[in-house]
């Protein structure tokens, strides 16, 4: 129960806290368990004890082992154990599982990734952050105090995040890195009765005879992935495929987009070489999902060409 795993990389600073807590006034003695040899408190040593903290500045692979801390008070002694492992630096980008701190989950509402163990160190801002070994750039990422904030979190933001900072000890600087996995929680999505954003109900669209025209049917259905949602065009209440006019075609497939966090679909109707008879047709933008069907009707009108002679 009073044993704690700690790990670090060679040539980086590692600071370990005694698993047994006590008042600041209590003295804490540290020993190397295998030899029962006392850890010095003098700061000129590479490895030294400083109250509840054991400092490796910097750490070496040979430092690996179990360290005993004894918290001494006038009335009792408490013993704790720190199991320290120092690893060689990896040459490749991959961070092995044994170097990972606890996984954190984020969502659209809460996307803070705290830098593990940073409170043990004497560090100054800014923190550097890396995802899968690549430096994070762009306005979506904000290093704030001891954590990273990601704006508009997406599933693609999941991955291994490394924070890097400098620990200062008596004017000497030591690098520290810590890595943890970040997973993106699927915020509970919802679906609602379709809302058609375009076209407006009973819209009149001006077109030029002989030219091509495009009509876009765009609707939103809720938040998150939508199940059985569709947008489509009908001509005079008939499916485009059944209407039988090769000049008037619906785009293959529906384009998915996100508007203010809502899941939306749009479908483009392409009319080639607009003819007079196209102005007589009723164009219906239909949006449907499990909640029901919404329909907006559009009609075409002739755009008068500008008379350059007048």
């Amino acid at each position: 129960k009073f044993s704690k795993q700690s790990w670090g990389l060679e040539n980086e600073a590692l600071i370990v806290r005694c698993p047994r807590q006590g008042k600041p006034s209590y003295t804490v003695d540290w020993y190397y368990s295998q030899t029962n040899k006392s850890i010095p408190t003098q700061e000129r040593n590479r490895v030294f004890a400083s109250g509840q903290l054991l400092k490796f500045l910097p750490a070496a692979v040979a430092d690996s082992g179990i360290y005993t801390c004894i918290v001494r008070s006038p009335t009792f002694n408490r013993t704790g154990y720190a199991n320290v492992t120092i690893y060689k630096k990896q040459s490749d980008c991959n961070v092995p599982d044994y170097l990972m701190y606890s996984t954190v989950s984020g969502s659209e509402k809460n996307s803070k990734i705290y830098c593990p163990t940073i409170d043990l160190y004497n560090w100054t801002a800014p923190l550097e952050w890396f995802k899968n070994c690549q430096a994070l750039q762009g306005s979506r990422y904000r290093a704030h105090k001891s954590f990273l904030v990601i704006d508009n979190v997406m599933t693609e933001d999941a991955g291994d995040y490394t924070c890097k900072f400098i620990h200062n000890e008596n004017g000497a600087n030591y690098s520290v890195t810590a890595t943890r996995s970040f997973t993106v929680k699927d915020e509970q999505g919802f679906s609602l009765f379709p809302v058609i954003g375009a076209p407006a109900q009973n819209e009149i669209k001006e077109v030029e005879i002989g030219k091509n025209a495009n009509l876009t049917c765009s609707a939103c259905f809720g938040k998150g992935t939508q199940f059985l949602a569709a947008v489509l065009w009908q001509l005079n209440g008939t499916k485009i495929t059944d209407f039988g006019e090769p000049r008037i075609q619906q785009e293959e497939g529906q384009n998915q987009s996100f508007s203010n966090g809502l899941a939306c679909l749009d479908m483009v109707l392409r009319i080639a070489d607009v003819k007079e008879e196209d102005l007589l047709l009723q164009y219906d933008c239909l949006a449907l999902n499990l909640h029901g069907l919404r329909r907006h009707t559009v009609r075409l009108s002739r755009k008068n060409p500008i008379d350059h002679h007048s």
């Epitope: 699927d186 509970q188 999505g189 998150g224 992935t225 939508q226 199940f227 059985l228 949602a229 569709a230 489509l232 009908q234 499916k239 239909l286 449907l288 999902n289 499990l290 909640h291 029901g292 069907l293």
Partner: antibody, heavy 119, light 107 residues
Amino acid sequence: EVQLLESGGGLVKPGGSLRLSCAASGFTFSSYWMSWVRQAPGKGLEWVSAIGGSGAGTYYADSVKGRFTISLDDSKNTLYLQMNSLKTEDTAVYYCARLSTVTRGFDYWGQGTLVTVSS
Amino acid sequence: DIQMTQSPSSLSASVGDRVTITCRASQSISNWLAWYQQKPGKAPKLLIYSASSLQNGVPSRFSGSGSGTDFTLTISSLQPEDFATYYCQQSYSTPPTFGQGTKVEIK
């Protein structure tokens, strides 16, 4: 009481066509998405197609896209599946099923109709 | 498409046994999971929807749990009429997909 009754199954040669019907009663047909789900002999369930919004929106499994057409007749409360260019792997019991708008589960199923594609 | 994987594919149990069937989705499906029971020569029957809600008329010995990618169907005390094949199905995204089924047989 909600009831779904399929018909139209039978033996057909590869490349042939068949039209399945599903007569519905006991609910407002146009308010629900309807689906066809099939089950090959000794195999699991496979969703085939869905239709909603009084026949406006249609979806198909990749395995049947371009060959099968789902449609419905609101006035007759009947769902159809027109199957063209049939293949031996289309051999299955075909069920029509109602999709609950609330639970997104298939809450009512027909008894199924067997389609056998064989030369 | 989202893949649904059930385990085990078959199991033998006795009347009164507690039976657990698991279903795993290839990506998070929130709680949009249904469980069906199918007996030979019959159409499937909806047991559980939204991962844990019992469909009307289904005995309370059936229960479902889970969210995200891992789901469980539990029959607390197996009855003779429960020997059948059970399927999970996701309705998180189109197309809806089913697990391959778990056959519950008499030991």
